[in-house]
Interface confidence: low
């Protein structure tokens, strides 16, 4: 026989299927061209010393053969003794260790037996009614296909499904769609209405995520102000990555998770813009404001839950940063100025109370004043930090204040509102003999002294009411006692206490008159 | 007849860059997916980047991540990847291929079953 013949004899081995598990399978047989025709098969096992043979039964019932060699596809025309416009039969028998292997059958005409390919370029995926949807177009000159999908995931094998026949220039697939696990897919292609038609091969993978994306489990850490206002924010543990099967691994488009950080400052309300979404990777600085933090997951179809936190305001205050002035028209902070065109965000809120009560105003932006300071004033009218109590100040700078990330913290402290220096005026003054020449004074903790850093110190005064002689004693903001020594039985004096801050001086309390009673001996 | 060809590898030393280009004639088609493959000696060949030619979507494999970045310019039919930061792992012989493709969707078929491949151009990196 000629090799490019179908060889009408016994094949030159005996006839005797192992039944091993390997050997050939995958037969595929198309016309490539007008008179030539291509089959092409696989062969699963060892190769070595394997000879394949390609054979062929007529529907007069005549059967033939094509030696192939050690190849797995093989070519011949339309002389080469094998109908192609009726009916054949074909399969591959493999010989190999003294026995032969035998692939299934395929029956088919192979005039009409076109080479089909899987879908071509894109896949779209979306998702509709619960189940995915796939679609794409139709590769060119192919309008006419029964089409199949096999998909797993990463812990389950292939399971096959069917997508109907398809008769249009798109063709599309219903597919089911997994809750919480990736899946791979692979869509493969026949001729419609053809007899024994080949499958296409599998095309490319399409890499689909869940339909809910993972919760991102995540964990943050902050790190300290630094000298300019601002603190990092630092991504402690990176989201956990979604376990693909094994034909996503690597490069798979379509099942990434994008996670994004979405910021909400809680401090100075009165800003223009309160939120800003991130990428999860880069990670920002903060002011020393309060915070929330919210780690969003998605993927291509949308949105999953999200983690929050909690990020406290940095509450380490700068004592003596602020000056405040009170006059006549109102009262003026000043503060060292950060640069020019500089917004403040200045915030105040009375201490002890809920964090919903913290008022805030926005300043024009502003360039430092002939001795480096910004400042801001209002009116006694506006009632702003009017009573007379503690509050805690903030002031926070930006160049750009609509850009969320970009604020700093220029300062923190505490302030004693209204009239702090009769407000903070000691009460309760008690004069107590000590001992033959001293006496020990006591005095009720200043309303100031619930203010950390604004009580700067007590001034205890001692008058001599016949001398007229006055003597002035400083005593430590966190003390309420002194002793006076030094003074003479039977002389009046009266004693008063005034609490002093940085910036004022207070008003002494009510004066108390004592004597230290002469001593008669026996 | 389409045809790929690649060009700018060379050998570099670890850390340094190299621009990759990859000019692509005889494809009429608008709408395509493009990509970057590589194969080291003794192991398969593995995906780098690709780009879609509707909306210019870019994928990159997690190892090259943050150094390589694919463009294209579709007036000159040649796409690009710029390599910074070189690894000695980054060694091998550098393809282009191309995929016939008609929208944009969440990736494209970024894989080494592309239908039209390049001769290679190859990127040696060593001290």
């Known amino acids: 026989c000629r090799t490019s013949e179908c060889c009408f004899q016994d094949p030159p081995y005996p006839d005797a299927d192992s039944g091993s598990a390997s050997g050939p399978r995958d037969l595929r047989c198309y016309r490539i061209s007008s008179d030539r025709y291509e089959c092409s098969w696989q062969y699963e096992g060892p190769t070595a010393g394997v000879s394949h043979f390609l054979r062929c039964c007529l529907s007069s019932g005549r059967c033939c053969y094509f030696a192939a060699g050690s190849a797995t596809r093989l070519q011949f025309s339309d002389q080469a003794g094998v109908s192609v416009l009726y009916t054949v039969t074909l399969w591959v028998e493999s010989w190999a260790r003294n026995q032969t292997e035998k692939s299934p059958e395929v029956t088919l005409q192979l005039y009409n037996s076109v080479k089909y390919e899987p879908p071509l370029g894109d896949i779209k995926v979306s998702k509709l009614a619960g189940q995915l949807r796939m679609e794409w177009e139709t590769p060119d000159n192919q309008v006419g296909a029964e089409v199949q999908f096999r998909h797993r995931t990463p812990s389950s094998p292939w399971k096959l499904g069917d997508c109907g026949p398809q008769d249009d220039d798109t063709e599309s697939c219903l597919c089911p769609l997994e809750m919480n696990v990736a899946q791979e897919f692979q869509l493969r292609r026949r001729q419609l209405g053809s007899q024994g038609s080949s499958w296409s091969k599998w095309s490319s993978p399409v890499c689909v995520p869940p339909e809910n994306p993972p919760q991102p489990q995540v964990r943050f850490s902050v790190e300290q102000l630094g000298q300019d206002g601002r603190r990092r924010l630092t991504l402690k543990e990176q989201p956990t990555q979604l376990e693909l099967p094994e034909g996503c691994q690597g490069l798979a488009p379509g099942t990434e998770v994008t996670y994004r950080l979405q910021l909400h400052m809680l401090s100075c309300p009165c800003k223009a813009k309160a939120t800003r979404t991130l990428h999860l990777g880069k990670m920002p600085y903060l002011s020393g404001a309060a915070y929330n933090v919210a780690v969003i997951s998605s993927n291509q179809f949308g949105p999953g839950l999200n983690q929050t936190w909690h990020i406290p305001a940095d509450t380490h205050t700068e004592p003596v940063a602020l000056n405040i002035s009170v006059g006549t028209n109102g009262t003026t902070m000043y503060w060292p100025a950060r640069a020019q065109s500089m917004t403040y965000c200045i915030e105040w809120q009375p201490v002890g109370q809920d964090g919903g009560l913290a008022t805030c105003s926005l300043t024009a932006p502003q360039d430092p004043d002939p001795a480096g300071m910004a400042t801001y004033s209002w009116s006694r009218e506006s009632g702003a930090m009017g009573q007379e109590k503690c509050y805690y100040i903030t002031i926070f700078a930006s160049a750009h204040p609509e850009k969320l990330t970009l604020w700093s913290t220029v300062l923190s402290t505490y302030h004693f509102g209204g009239n702090a220096s009769a407000a903070g005026t000691p009460h309760h003054v008690s004069v107590k003999n000590h001992s033959l020449d001293s006496v020990s004074v006591d005095w009720a903790p200043s309303l100031l002294s619930t203010c950390p850093g604004v009580l700067k110190e007590y001034v205890v005064r001692c008058r001599d009411e016949d001398s007229k002689q006055v003597s002035e004693h400083p005593v430590q903001p966190t003390e309420t006692q002194v002793t006076l020594s030094g003074l003479r039985a039977g002389v009046a004096y009266t004693v008063q206490v005034r609490a002093d801050t940085a910036w004022l001086r207070g008003v002494w309390s009510q004066p108390q008159r004592f004597s230290i009673e002469v001593q008669v001996s026996d | 007849q389409v045809q790929l060809q690649e060009s700018g590898g060379a050998l570099v030393q670890p850390g340094g860059s190299l621009r990759l280009s990859c000019v692509v004639s005889?494809?009429?088609?608008?709408?395509?997916?493009i990509g970057w493959f590589r194969q080291a000696p003794g192991k398969e060949r593995e995906g780098v980047s690709c780009i879609g030619s509707s909306d210019g979507s870019t994928i990159y494999s997690d190892s090259v991540k943050g150094r390589f970045t694919i463009s294209r310019d579709n007036a000159k039919n040649t796409v690009y990847l710029q390599m910074n930061s070189l690894k000695p792992e980054d060694t091998g012989v550098y393809y282009c291929a191309l995929d016939r493709g008609r929208r944009t969707i969440i990736g494209y078929a970024c894989y080494a079953t592309m239908k039209y491949w390049g001769k290679g151009t190859p990127v040696t990196v060593s001290s």
């Open positions: 005889g494809f009429t088609s608008d709408y395509f997916a």
